[in-house]
């Protein structure tokens, strides 16, 4: 069985302020089991954008239906983009762990740039 890969096909995405940004991410396997999370930035200071397990992320919607048992698409859409949202977004697969899940593999990242709202 091939080891899971995290695929973020776009290196960069450009969106006008006020619009929605779609950030694509796909897994090549369902194993190991564990949640998907999206972060802006890398390292200790990274910002959690979406956690499959829990939390309320009012600006984030998933593109696919994550409750499908065979779902491999973890793309997200972020609404009402502002210049403050610019940055590099990483789709990260965690494997289950106790007491804390363990980061397993990260996508290469997608850089989001924000264009000025057309006048």
């Amino acid at each position: 069985e091939d080891e899971l890969q995290v695929i973020q096909p776009e290196k960069s995405v450009s969106v006008a302020a006020g619009e929605s940004a779609t950030l694509r991410c796909a897994m090549t396997s369902l194993i190991p089991v564990g949640p998907i999370m999206w972060f802006r930035g890398a390292g200790a200071g990274r910002e959690l954008i979406y956690n499959q397990k829990e939390g309320h992320f009012p600006r984030v919607t998933t593109v696919s239906e994550l409750t499908k048992r065979n779902n491999l698409d973890f793309s997200i859409s972020i609404s009402n983009i502002t210049p403050a949202d610019a940055g590099t977004y990483y789709c990260v697969k965690f494997r289950k762990g106790s007491p804390d899940d363990v980061e397993f593999k990260s996508g290469a990242g997608t850089e989001l740039s924000v264009r000025a709202k057309p006048s």
């Epitope: 194993i31 397990k53 409750t67 289950k96 106790s98």
Partner: antibody, heavy 118, light 107 residues
Framework: DVQLVESGGGVVRPGESLRLSCAAS????????MSWVRQAPGKGLEWLAG????????YYIDSVKGRFTISRDNSKSSLYLRMNSLTAEDTAVYYC???????????WGLGTLVTVSS | ALTQPASVSANPGETVKITCSGG??????YAWYQQKSPGSAPVTVI????ERPSDIPSRFSGSASGSAATLIITGVRVEDEAVYFC???????????FGAGTTLTVL
Amino acid sequence: DVQLVESGGGVVRPGESLRLSCAASGFTFSSHAMSWVRQAPGKGLEWLAGISAGGSDTYYIDSVKGRFTISRDNSKSSLYLRMNSLTAEDTAVYYCARETWNHLFDYWGLGTLVTVSS
Amino acid sequence: ALTQPASVSANPGETVKITCSGGDYYSTYYAWYQQKSPGSAPVTVIHSDDERPSDIPSRFSGSASGSAATLIITGVRVEDEAVYFCGGYDGRTYINTFGAGTTLTVL
């Protein structure tokens, strides 16, 4: 508070059909996958079928595939189980259960008893 | 199939451990369901290996390692008498399974 209330159970003869319902309240029904689980008298729990939040994907244990059909109506916050060609072995309490993000169960209904007897 | 002991007994205040084996660690999540009488509604005491619902007392905890999961009740009480079913979800097969149940008797 999350509430799941099953209905539609009763006594039927072998070979007959039955449709069970589960009315959900206290949560956003359309955001959760759901399942049916049964318990035969004096036996353990047996998962039967699951359905994704939008209803497009369904999953079954092999022993009921082709005979049982799980469905849902998100506009009514209701889950259903259509059971055909019932046999005595289908006699059980049938529970609906809400799924967690990883397809385990966090809330259960009180159950409805199905008795298949001639 | 998930395997668990048929019965366990303990005195009030003792720590009880119930094990459940048979799942592959990398593809299986475990849960524990409490049923106080046959045919009554099960109550989820642990899901996702070690997550406790907010309305479940803190004396219930769970863990998983290798091919087994464990339910731990620290300071067991008389009202914890019940049958405890372990349950698993296998991400390879998309199937939920249950153990046969463990009857906990508090002496």
